[in-house]
Interface confidence: low
């Protein structure tokens, strides 16, 4: 079950607990997490992570017991950890991952917890002993049972089945806001000296919150949102409001680089490196942060803040959230990802921007692109309109800008001349007594995927040229062949003549020159990320996935790619998992990514695989994966034995029993079989696929995977009274493929 940092489950406990057998398996990357609370008016049992260590607090009547794991073993490493806490006959024992961590005597009184069990968080429970407890769990509870019964059922709508992908997402995975009430909360955004917030935004939302940070003083905040398709930033301080708009449209479904920069003197928002900033009025001063940095949505308190604000910042959208995604998020220069979030609501790992709706456009016919770019640019308020001074010649009567800009069209990887039609003057230069050589262009920001090449001595270094150079075809754009269909140059244009003219022309005007890239279909090709040799154990199967081979095609999505296995189909070792025995001569890139394919070795020398991949228009050259089958070697890694009280049960965990094989990047099936009769007990396996609360059954065989999932245990069934410790010798054999290791 997945808990997102603000959720919990409650389980009623109507009677006192005399014995406790609590088993939890959890994983989290957060150093703080409340795992479980059994709550009564005074009696309680609390299990929490604090600074990455597991702490157990048991209060029975007047007695208090505390147990904790060692400081050097941090459990906030995103790896599943199994915790077993037993309280039986006045003795409490805590073990983590099969190792005994602590034990202590406890009073024999039953635990009176009529308020029930709280799993993953305490909800609205307000009890004095809960002060200072950890935050609610953000992570997964893979299993939670008390005295053999599941604590994870029924799930409430905000606690999800399984373990969410977002908990293991690295910070290069986008934050996907799937709405309508999406939200990600991160540690507070401090802006004492200066604060920066940077991300790449992809959305079609015309109104949506992007970032909110409350201040320590009531009513102070920083708020960034999309307002009517453009970025807006608001800083509210005791002494007034600073409001800033950026004129670059962002609600076009394209990625935009966003940067928000704040210090005591000014606020700046920049979209695709086009900045807007306040003058250095010094009104901002320092905003002491309070609470979390909210991204993509607002919580109830933030909504209230904004609704109460005199500017009426959120007319109808206080509960709306961003529909789209943020990539490459960094806060004050530190990368942040879903894993660092304190809580999330309705989030997805990765950018799945309304895929269904736009898939056809994204990979459709290339002709479609020629109509996209020109329509995307006119909304840009560049340059800033120029207001001519009074008394200028009549030619400047209705003057606002010197040039009319038209997009430059270039083929992917090709070149295009910058021509007069791209930068056409709005007035008659002769009448204004201006020469083409006096209209000076300087490149203030180059294109992301190409270079403006100037065939003029010394100009390339200065990045400057004139309108006369344009007419003489001295400036051409060379595209680098990348796949983006649009780009832009930022040009500053000034006039160097000494004739009467608006002062803005002397200072210079900034223009955006859109560049539209017409795509070219590139053929796909096959790459082997770990080399073109694959090792498999004899008589086993190995998954074929992107870690073995993959297609690289810069202009086709995975959906459009198909692999073919070349050679005779009879005896072909590639199969779909769900169609064993049936050769897979052709399969899709999606199937490969989904892990649907396996290489099956049935004996003899392994067969090499030769593939090619096609995007429907062009196919790659064939590529061969060499396959070597090796004989399984099995080695005992751990066989520690168990120590348990007569009549009790103890899980057999990897710390007690595990083997290693010579498999390379292959998750092989390791089978243990009991070869001798047991005298004092029985080996049991949990039925029904490891469901919490499922029954335990006597078994003669189990897999290493069962051990890893805590589904195997030894149950002492010997009723006789012994004056000495009895020893059960468990004789096992291990099988991998057709290789057997006996007398384990």
């Amino acid at each position: 079950a997945s808990f997102f940092g603000e959720n919990h489950l409650e389980v009623p406990v109507a009677t006192a607990l005399t014995d406790i057998d609590l088993q939890l398996q959890f994983s989290t990357s957060q150093p703080e997490a409340l795992l479980l609370l059994a709550a009564g008016p005074a009696d309680h049992l609390l299990l929490q992570l604090y600074s990455g260590r597991l702490q157990v607090r048991l209060v029975l009547g007047q007695e208090e017991l505390r147990l904790q794991t060692p400081a050097e073993t941090l459990l906030s490493d995103s790896i599943p950890h199994t915790v077993v806490l037993t309280v039986v006959e006045g003795w409490a024992t805590l073990s983590v991952d099969g190792f005994l961590n602590a034990s202590s005597a406890v009073p024999g009184a039953p635990l009176e917890v009529p308020y029930g069990l709280f799993v993953g968080g305490t909800g609205t429970l307000g009890l004095p002993y809960l002060r200072g407890t950890s935050r609610p769990l953000r992570g997964c509870l893979h299993a939670a049972t008390l005295n053999g019964r599941s604590l994870l059922r029924p799930l409430t709508p905000d606690v999800h089945e399984g373990c969410a992908e977002e908990f293991s997402a690295s910070d290069d995975v986008a934050l996907g806001f799937s709405g309508p009430h999406s939200l990600a909360a991160f540690p507070a955004w401090g802006t004492q000296d200066e604060g920066t917030l940077e991300f790449t935004l992809t959305t079609q939302s015309r109104q949506a919150p992007l970032a909110f940070q409350a201040g320590g003083r009531r009513g102070d905040f920083i708020y960034v949102d999309i307002f009517e398709g453009h970025l807006r930033a608001v800083v509210e301080k005791g002494q007034g409001t600073v409001l800033l708009h950026n004129s670059v449209p962002v609600a076009d479904g394209q990625p935009h680089e966003v940067s928000v920069h704040i210090n005591a003197h000014r606020l700046e928002i920049s979209v695709d490196q086009y900045p807007t900033h306040t003058s250095n009025r010094g009104v901002l001063s320092y905003l002491e942060p309070r609470g979390s940095l909210l991204l993509g949505g607002l919580d109830a308190e933030a909504s209230r803040h904004l609704q109460e604000h005199r500017l009426g910042l959120t007319p109808e959208a206080t509960n709306a959230s961003l529909l789209g995604c943020m990539e490459d998020l960094s806060v004050n220069g530190q990368r942040r990802g879903l894993r660092e979030a304190l809580l999330t609501r309705n989030m997805a790992a990765g950018c799945r921007l309304e895929e269904e709706e736009y898939e056809d456009d994204a990979y459709g016919h290339y002709e479609a692109f020629s109509t996209l770019a020109p329509e995307a640019w006119p909304a840009m308020e560049l340059p800033e309109p120029c207001v001519p001074e009074p008394g200028l010649p009549p030619v400047f009567a209705n003057f606002t800008q010197l040039l009319t800009i038209s997009p430059l069209v270039v083929a992917e990887g090709g070149t295009a001349w910058l021509e007069w039609r791209h930068v056409q003057p709005t007035l008659d230069l002769m009448e204004a007594e201006l020469r083409k050589s006096q209209v000076l262009f300087s490149v203030t920001r180059g294109a992301r995927h190409g270079e403006l090449e100037l065939d003029i001595p010394g100009a390339q270094a200065r990045k400057m040229f004139t309108l006369l150079d344009v007419v003489n075809r001295k400036a051409r754009f060379i595209h680098d062949g990348s796949e983006d269909t649009s780009d832009q140059l930022v040009l500053e244009v000034s006039v160097t003549a000494r004739v009467p003219m608006p002062s803005c022309l002397r200072r210079g005007q900034t223009y955006l020159l859109p560049i539209q890239v017409n795509p070219v279909n590139d053929p796909p090709h096959i790459i082997f990320p770990h080399g073109s040799l694959m090792v498999i154990l004899e008589h086993t199967q190995k998954p074929l996935g992107p870690e073995v081979f993959q297609a690289y095609d810069p202009d086709s999505a995975c959906e459009g790619l198909t692999f073919q296995v070349l050679g005779t189909s009879s005896g072909l070792p590639v199969e779909r998992r769900d169609q064993p025995g049936e050769p897979a001569t052709e399969f899709s890139c999606r199937e490969l990514e989904a892990g649907s394919l396996v290489y099956v070795h049935r004996g003899g020398p392994a067969q090499d695989l030769t593939f090619r991949v096609s995007d429907g228009l062009q196919a790659s050259p064939p590529a061969t994966l060499k396959v070597v089958a090796i004989r399984p070697a099995i080695q005992i890694h751990r066989s520690t034995g168990l120590r348990l009280a007569q009549g009790s049960a103890m899980p057999i965990l990897p710390a007690n029993l595990s083997v290693e094989t010579n498999a390379v990047g292959q998750d092989v099936s390791v089978l243990f079989r009991v070869t001798g009769a047991l005298q004092f007990g029985e080996l049991q396996k949990q039925g029904a696929g490891g469901v919490e609360g499922a029954e335990w059954w006597a078994t003669q065989a189990f897999h290493q995977r069962d051990v890893e999932q805590g589904r195997v245990r030894y149950l002492s069934t010997d009723p006789q009274h012994h004056a000495y410790d009895t020893v059960e010798n468990l004789a096992l054999e291990v099988q991998v493929g057709q290789e057997i290791l006996s007398n384990l």
Partner: antibody, heavy 122, light 107 residues
Framework: EVQVEVSGGGLVQPGGSMRLSCAVS????????MNWVRQSPEKGLEWIAE??????????YYAESVKGRFTISRDNSKNSLYLQMISLRAEDTAIYYC?????????????WGQGTLLTVSS | DIVMTQSQDSMATSVGERVTVNCKAS??????VAWYQQKPGQSPEPLLF???YRYTGVPDRFSGSGSGTDFTLTISSVQAEDVAEYFC?????????FGQGTKLEIK
Amino acid sequence: EVQVEVSGGGLVQPGGSMRLSCAVSGFTFSNYWMNWVRQSPEKGLEWIAEIRLKSNNFARYYAESVKGRFTISRDNSKNSLYLQMISLRAEDTAIYYCTSYGNYVGHYFDHWGQGTLLTVSS
Amino acid sequence: DIVMTQSQDSMATSVGERVTVNCKASQNVDTNVAWYQQKPGQSPEPLLFSASYRYTGVPDRFSGSGSGTDFTLTISSVQAEDVAEYFCQQYNSYPLTFGQGTKLEIK
């Protein structure tokens, strides 16, 4: 011995209101999550509402079919559970049972009252 | 919502016979299923919880099995007093839902 007595059923017109009560003895009422479940020939058994403990701020959960029309409440001092129903419809006609949840092993119903019949008809 | 479907609306058997009542969930509910018995004119009473655990005082001729989506209530040797309607219920997720019931009659 556990006893669960339900009262308050009867005939009511569509659009009307009704309050059902449930008195409990024989177990510590304040420690149990309580529910209303109804049964009709058309829909069979149907869970409709749950109320938790004082320590849970008396959190309430409802089935979609009754959300906004029915309100579950409890009075621990009187060992009583209530169901206030407004905007009643013909499809609310059923026998209404007051039930409690089993002890921490899961959300199954272990104590059932004898039920009271509510008929919504003009 | 999770739909619980009991394959037979009614079944007739003889005293001493073994009988099984089936229940299918529309999605995985692990073992979070309870069974109830409702005798004519009475309230339902719990028989089993967690798919296979007998409720206090329930005779051991009643047993249950299953996990995931398929569940079975078995009466190993039917007695005259077992004439009743039997319901399954899932408590894997809200809303909690019941099967439509299976009536057991004696021939």
